[in-house]
């Protein structure tokens, strides 16, 4: 049994990264494998992450962590039985992968404005708090044309629209993402998405 | 809004015993380490103990065998233990979250040895 | 154990100048595991800096951290009356544990 493609790990910057790799073969992760974890610290204790299944020879491991400071580095073992297949290490603040938006909603009520609002996926004391900025992807349920992306670079997760920058009487979606300069993250998944029916009154043509 | 509410200090005898109690809020913490740091009057700082997630601890060698930390995730609370109190333990406790460095800090508490 | 040696003890000067604070390693430190903190009378110290030049949140940008290995600085740019206070550098080691410096009081002149 051998390691095909090395485990890659990407952390949200929280409690939980996220580690995959293949092997060189099919692989019952969870019977055959253990990935032992342990961050570099003197009050630190080893873990053990049970792998599942990623795809008939991939793997994939959610450890479970301390909050994230900068600083951290974690030992990885990967073992099959008695046998050390793979060593290695991670340093989670050089692999971030933000967690994704939540409670996205659209408010139509803002005469003729859009005002769409999120949550922020980080409680106050997250280091990433205060450094996300946002990508809106809006788009037509009737017109895969119809797509369009707005970058929220404040802090603030919300973004304002006039309802006339899109089309009247049809249904959009909206669905927000992500990521962080400051550790130059991926960008997080999109968060569900939402629907709803634009309509809003024409102006008056003046003749 | 991280905080961290210590209790617990008084005046002890020489040989006495005493617990520190730190009650925090505003984040997760069972994922954090928490420590001890005491200051003696007029004197600087000095790391007293810590303790990790999974329960891993470490002293100073000046209370080792004296004092036990400890943690109860369910009440965030970290306490400390402090047995055969002598003279120069009188200080003021700082509870503090951290790991390399310490991010938030109790108010304090004044421990009194005297006779 | 690593022993930090802060110099100098007491720093006298004027609100609008600039302090230069020195902390000095019996060993070689990670720049990683350095910190430094502010303490006002009767109060709990305040994280200024760590990982030897990062500003923890909330600090203002006047306050700044260099060095590496055995000689690691605070500097203050421009002295406000809230800045006179007592200032300690701390580190880290896998080993040992956690250590500060003897402090260094930053007083009005």
């Known amino acids: 049994m051998k390691v095909l493609q090395e485990p890659t790990c990407v952390s949200d910057y929280m409690s939980i990264s996220t580690c995959e790799w293949k092997m060189n073969g099919p692989t019952n992760c969870s019977t055959e494998l253990r990935l032992l974890y342990q961050l570099v610290f003197l009050l630190s204790e080893a873990h053990t992450c049970i792998p599942e299944n990623n795809g008939g020879a991939g793997c994939v491991c959610h450890l479970l962590m301390d909050d994230v400071v900068s600083a951290d580095n974690y030992t990885l073992d990967l073992w099959a039985g008695q046998q050390l297949l793979w060593k290695g290490s991670f340093k989670p603040s050089e692999h971030v992968k933000p967690r994704a938006p939540g409670n996205l909603t659209v408010h139509t009520n803002v005469s003729d404005t859009l005002l769409l609002t999120w949550s922020n996926p980080y409680p106050p004391d997250n280091y990433l708090y205060n450094h996300l900025t946002y990508a809106v992807n809006i788009w037509s349920e009737n017109d895969p044309a119809d797509f369009r992306i707005y970058n929220v670079t404040y802090l603030e997760p919300s973004l304002r629209i006039a309802a006339s920058t899109l089309k009247s009487g049809i249904s959009y979606r909206a669905r927000v993402r992500a990521w962080a300069q400051c550790y130059n993250t991926t960008w997080s998944e999109w968060s569900p998405s939402t629907k709803w029916h634009n309509s809003y009154r024409e102006p008056f043509e003046q003749h | 809004e991280v905080q961290l509410v210590q209790s617990g200090g008084g005046l002890v005898h020489p040989g006495g015993s005493l617990r520190l109690s730190c009650a925090g809020s505003g984040f997760t913490f069972s994922r954090n380490a928490m420590f001890w740091v005491r200051q003696a009057p007029g004197k600087g700082l000095e790391w007293v103990s810590g303790?990790?997630?999974?329960?891993?601890?470490n002293y100073a060698d000046s209370v080792k065998g004296r004092f036990t930390i400890s943690r109860d995730n369910a009440k965030n609370s970290l306490y400390l233990q402090m047995n055969s109190l002598r003279a120069e333990d009188m200080a003021v406790y700082y509870c503090?979250?951290?790991?390399?460095?310490?991010?938030?800090w109790g108010q304090g508490t004044l421990v009194t040895v005297s006779s | 154990e690593i022993v930090l040696t802060q110099s100098p003890g007491t720093l006298s000067l004027s609100p609008g100048e600039r302090a230069t604070l020195s902390c000095r390693a019996s060993q070689s430190v990670s720049n990683s595991y350095l910190a430094w903190y502010q303490q006002k009378p009767g109060q709990a110290p305040r994280l200024l800096i760590f990982g030897a030049s990062s500003r923890a949140p909330g600090i203002p940008d006047r306050f700044s951290g260099s060095g590496s290995g055995t000689d690691f600085t605070l500097t203050i740019s421009r002295l406000e009356p809230e800045d006179f206070a007592v200032y300690y550098c701390?580190?880290?080691?896998?080993?040992?544990?956690?250590?500060f410096g003897q402090g260094t009081k930053v007083e009005i002149k």
């Open positions: 303790i990790g997630t999974g329960g891993a601890t």
């Open positions: 701390q580190q880290y080691d896998h080993s040992a544990g956690w250590t």
């Open positions: 503090a979250r951290g790991r390399y460095y310490f991010d938030y």
